[in-house]
């Protein structure tokens, strides 16, 4: 009996036309939602004038349906048993699952001012930028609608820059009508233990963002893993959102709609400093902000964001060192709400439920040549927003799963 089940599973998880896995892989049958909480700055003037702590108040959720589009340009390569594809991006606002509208206003860091002062450290260039910032009546903080902040707006300061720069700014700009990839993954035909594991991303086996092994593209995209998952495994996956590969470890057994699943979580060790976890040494790319690589819980992904000083963390700086959050008031990290987990059905390796949580922050530094940043006395890693992307297998699919997979085994 077990051999027959193994044989069936091996056949059905292969990523090729006609299998159960392929149908669900092309276009997920699970509804995926991305909830955003925006950090509304309560004291912009005091920060700018006195270098006070930034007082934030999170507002949300603002919910979007995401990943509803089928994979595109799916191409099988029988020579190396891979399948390549693009993952199109799309987001549809869900008013009934949100606390307000996309027109809601927020006081947030001026993304362009913070980024420009970082990208152009040349003091004379900063003098030029200062004149343009003043001319455009821009400041350290700005008021933007949710739609503008997430999906993009034309920045008045950047519009005055005589040098060819993109004048549109947004935390996820551009998003709609774009695609992630090309991904090339193993289809599992020759070896089921490699199914869904990424061979190349954008035509390369490395990212070119990090040194050494940190730069590797490891594992799958976390939507599924090779079958017959063991609790002792360390599940590697690549997330283009955070520009790196990361891993999850077994935490507990969970019953999901009658299906036994393994809950894998991202451990705090994955966010540790090289002092605590030497394996992370190559994720520390600079010495000043990281306090000689002793800070933890934030990842500088500026190299992956055209030099913009973007830092990724867990929401509310969960698992981050005290020095990171000491300049921010109003944060309440909570493991249950703010960690990332994957609920994996171990026989098939399918992720049947997940919650991906991350926070996007921007570094802003004092600049004696830019008036609106001149009175700052310290660096700030400013939280802009955090997101919770979730998906849970639907009731019908769960029923099918119980009858065709777990039921047969039990």
């Amino acid at each position: 009996g077990d051999m027959l089940i193994q044989k069936t599973i091996k056949k059905e998880v292969v990523l090729e036309e006609g299998t159960i896995a392929f149908k669900n892989w092309v276009k997920t049958g699970t509804e995926i939602y991305r909830q955003f909480w925006i950090f509304d700055v309560q004291n912009p003037q005091e920060v700018m004038m006195n270098s006070s702590n930034i007082q934030v108040k999170q507002r949300g959720p603002y919910t979007y349906r995401v990943r509803f589009l089928a994979k595109e340009n799916i191409t099988q390569d029988p020579k190396d048993n891979t399948v390549s594809f693009l993952q199109p991006n799309g987001a549809i606002f869900e008013p009934s699952l949100s606390v307000g509208t996309e027109a809601d206003n927020f006081t947030v860091l001026n993304l362009a001012v913070a980024a420009a002062s970082h990208i152009y450290p040349n003091p004379f260039v900063q003098v030029v930028l200062n004149s343009l910032i003043n001319k455009s009546k821009s400041s350290m903080f700005q008021v933007r609608t949710l739609r503008e902040l997430l999906w993009g707006y034309t920045d008045p300061f950047l519009s005055l820059v005589p040098y060819p720069v993109s004048t549109r700014v947004g935390m996820f700009y551009p998003y709609n009508n774009t695609a992630d990839g090309v991904y090339k993954v193993f289809n599992g035909k020759d070896s089921i233990s490699k199914v869904a594991i990424i061979d190349t991303y954008k035509g390369k086996r490395n990212l070119s963002y990090w040194e050494s092994y940190c730069d590797m593209i490891n594992g799958t995209d976390a939507a599924s893993f090779p079958p017959f998952v063991e609790k002792s495994q360390v599940l590697q996956f690549f997330s283009s959102d955070i520009c790196r590969s990361i891993y999850a470890v077994f935490e507990s057994d969970v019953n999901l709609k009658g299906i036994p699943v393994y809950r894998f979580v991202l451990p705090s060790k994955a966010f540790a400093s090289p002092v605590q976890n030497p394996d992370n040494h190559c994720f520390c790319t600079e010495k000043i902000i990281s306090k000689n690589c002793t800070s933890y819980g934030v990842l500088d992904i500026s190299k992956c964001k055209e030099g913009k000083p973007v830092y990724i963390s867990l929401p509310h700086f969960l698992y981050a060192s005290p020095d990171v959050s000491e300049t921010i008031d109003g944060l309440n990290p909570n493991e249950e709400e703010h960690r990332t987990y994957l609920d994996i059905e171990p026989i098939t390796g399918f992720t049947l439920q997940f919650a991906k949580r991350l926070q996007v922050n921007l570094l802003v530094k004092p600049s004696n040549k830019i008036q609106v940043l001149k009175r700052l006395k310290r660096n700030y890693i400013v939280p802009i927003l955090w997101l919770n992307e979730t998906g849970t297998i639907g009731d019908e699919k769960a029923k099918m799963f119980r009858s065709q997979v777990t039921g047969k085994i039990n």
């Epitope: 040349n122 004379f124 260039v125 003098v127 030029v128 040098y163 008036q371």
Partner: antibody, heavy 118, light 104 residues
Framework: AVTLDESGGGLQTPGRALSLVCKAS????????MFWVRQAPGKGLEWVAG????????LYGAAVKGRATISRDNGQSTVRLQLNNLRAEDTGTYYC???????????WGHGTEVIVSS | ALTQPSSVSANPGETVKITCSGG???YGWYQQKSPGSAPVTVI????KRPSDIPSRFSGSASGSTATFTITGVQAEDEAVYYC???????????FGAGTTLTVL
């Protein structure tokens, strides 16, 4: 030694255009911002224009804004100041200067004299 | 423009201090020995001295005020000294009107 040599001055007619060139040597020209500073007879120093190390960003003093263009050729180690619609008050000695990297001059040229007169 | 005294005088060997205010940061001090002669940088970036400038010349800055000091002034130091910096309310670099140093 750092050397900055200006040329292109002389007697000019009001309303016409002027082109001053500064030839640099003795340092890695492409690593420095460059400025033009002028001094009217019997007066103090006045900042005219600046350009960043790769020529992307420029800035002009209020008196010449809209009439001046500063440009550079890193291959030739030269910086140029084009000044249009000359006026009598543009008369003076024009100095090429090197920015130390913090909008603070650390080297000057010998200057080229410009006289605007009909 | 930056504000500096129009003139100061001192006996040889004395210490001379010239202040400059109104700029935002990174001051420089420029010596001009005669009208029409090229200025010479004696201090740049507040306190840095070019290698060919004697150690009696020094500079410092605190807040929006810079101070230029000649410790043990000599006859050949007689000149006009201009401070230069960046004025945040103005787009670009600015200079003071110059301080004439007379060595008695």
């Amino acid at each position: 030694a750092v050397t900055l040599d200006e040329s292109g001055g002389g007697l000019q007619t009001p309303g016409r255009a002027l082109s001053l060139v500064c030839k640099a040597s003795g340092f890695t020209f492409s690593s420095y911002n460059m400025f033009w500073v002028r001094q009217a007879p019997g007066k103090g120093l006045e900042w005219v224009a600046g350009i960043d190390d790769d020529g992307s960003f420029t800035l002009y003093g209020a008196a010449v804004k809209g009439r001046a263009t500063i440009s550079r050729d890193n291959g030739q180690s030269t910086v140029r100041l084009q000044l249009n619609n000359l006026r009598a008050e543009d008369t003076g000695t024009y100095y090429c200067a090197r920015d130390s990297g913090a909008v603070s001059i650390d080297a000057w040229g010998h200057g080229t004299e410009v006289i605007v007169s009909s | 423009a930056l504000t500096q005294p129009s003139s100061v005088s001192a006996n040889p060997g004395e210490t001379v201090k010239i202040t400059c205010s109104g700029g935002d940061s990174d001051y420089g001090w420029y010596q001009q020995k005669s009208p029409g002669s090229a200025p010479v940088t004696v201090i740049y970036q507040n306190d840095k001295r070019p290698s060919d400038i004697p150690s009696r010349f020094s500079g410092s800055a605190s807040g929006s005020t810079a101070t230029f000091t000649i410790t043990g002034v000599q006859a050949e130091d007689e000149a006009v000294y201009y401070c230069g910096g960046w004025d945040g309310s103005y787009d670009g670099a600015v200079f003071g009107a110059g301080t004439t140093l007379t060595v008695l």
